[in-house]
């Protein structure tokens, strides 16, 4: 988790003077509670943005927005804290808004906004905004929270980030896998403009389990220039075992860009249709 | 956690042999197919052999007559086994997993007189 590199972050606005500085995600209110403090923020909304680098690097963010109750709170109300965690790693980055004037009612209801947290492809994500300073132990609890799920590469304006095509979503195998006779799968797929290898894993199923009955590897050395772009055709052979016949085929590509962790690409094929089998007809008929 | 860990590497004379070995923790490394891949300093890394699940074996052409890769299922282990070691073979030799897209740290092999 990291955050824009911005020149400078701004939360101010007309009748506010804000500043946005790092935090520990430990506000100074947890350790020294206040006796008044603010209602908890408004109608939390967050959307997938997208925002360059100073150098040029587009990046997916979470747009973050929230609204201020209309009650008389808004008078002890000296910021907020916003942290965002990554629920698989539990990983968390905080910021806060540190108002430098005192808040008055106005015509409109004060709305805040900031997209600034770099987030990752496929990804969820908790976003909790804290109003300032935060509540006494058995006080209200004044913040609201909400998951955000990050689209995959596969997504359209996901595809085209600087971390996607870094793990290269802009490359599409068009992956094709046909059966053939005597235990054999023909892939063919569309090859990338750059030298370096593939590795094509076939992992073999029974019809209708999740536990494989065959695992098999196939190196692909690295193409020529000259075959950038065209189709490479490889025969796998499949282990004649009964029952064995569901087949993912999964390519590994291992672009300069993104090495051992580039996005895999994968097509399945099924178990052949079995014929409805019809009743069979007894070669008596039972008098009753 | 899940990792794998090579061993068996070290300094050989031309001409000499050792056995490479790859163990898995937190994964049952018998239901997978299992690669050796080899990187010399400043170079790509390059494939050296694969083993799959049913025991079929592939091979580099440089390598082939000269190495051969094997499994024990009830160890748990995956061997390269070098023989007929040339200054070319010189590497860190890394074992991976490619369904979990697992690589261990590697294992140094120098082929020096």
């Known amino acids: 988790l990291r955050l824009l590199d911005h020149r400078a972050l701004v939360c101010s606005q007309p009748g506010l003077n804000c500043t946005v500085k790092n935090s520990t995600c430990l506000d100074d209110s947890w350790i020294h509670p206040r006796n008044l403090t603010p209602s908890s923020p408004k109608d939390l909304q967050i959307q997938l943005h997208f925002a360059h680098t100073q150098q040029g690097d587009l990046f997916p963010v979470a747009h973050i927005e929230w609204t201020l109750q209309t009650d008389a709170s808004i008078l002890y109300l000296e910021g907020a804290e916003l942290s965002v965690l990554q629920l698989n790693t539990n990983e968390r980055l905080c910021v806060r808004f540190e108002f430098l004037s005192k808040l008055r009612h106005h015509h409109r209801r004060w709305r805040f906004t900031f997209s600034h947290f770099v987030v990752d492809p496929d990804q969820e994500y908790e976003v909790t905004v804290h109003h300032l300073p935060k509540p006494i132990p058995d006080g209200d609890p004044n913040h609201q929270s909400k998951n955000f799920l990050v689209p995959d590469c596969e997504h359209a304006r996901m595809k085209v980030t600087t971390p996607c095509m870094s793990s290269g979503s802009l490359w599409d195998p068009n992956i094709t896998v046909e059966t053939l006779e005597a235990h054999q799968l023909r892939v063919s797929f569309t090859l990338w403009n750059e030298s370096t290898h593939y590795q094509i894993l076939l992992t073999s199923f029974p019809h209708m389990e999740n536990h494989s009955c065959f695992e098999h590897m196939h190196h692909i050395p690295a193409p020529r220039p000259e075959e950038f772009h065209q189709r490479s055709n490889v025969t796998l052979t499949l282990r004649n075992l009964k029952g064995c016949c569901r087949h993912q085929v999964q390519i590994q590509p291992f672009f300069s860009s993104c090495l051992n962790d580039c996005l895999r690409h994968s097509a399945t094929v099924s178990c052949p249709e079995m014929p409805d089998t019809p009743e069979p007809i007894p070669d008596y008929m039972p008098l009753w | 956690e899940v990792q794998l860990v090579e061993s068996g590497g070290g300094l050989v004379q031309p001409g000499g042999s050792l056995r490479l070995s790859c163990a898995a923790s937190?994964?049952?490394?018998?239901?997978?197919?299992v690669a050796w891949y080899r990187q010399a300093p400043g170079k790509q890394r390059d494939f050296v052999a694969t083993?799959?699940?049913?025991?079929?074996?592939t091979y580099t052409e440089s390598v082939k007559g000269r190495f051969t890769i094997s499994r024990d299922n009830a160890k748990g282990t995956v061997y390269l086994q070098v023989n007929r070691l040339k200054p070319e073979d010189t590497a860190v030799y890394i074992c991976?997993?490619?369904?979990?897209?697992?690589w261990g740290q590697g294992t140094q092999v120098t082929v020096s007189s």
């Open positions: 991976n997993v490619p369904s979990y897209n697992l």
């Open positions: 937190g994964i049952i490394l018998s239901d997978n197919a």
């Open positions: 083993i799959n699940t049913a025991g079929w074996t």
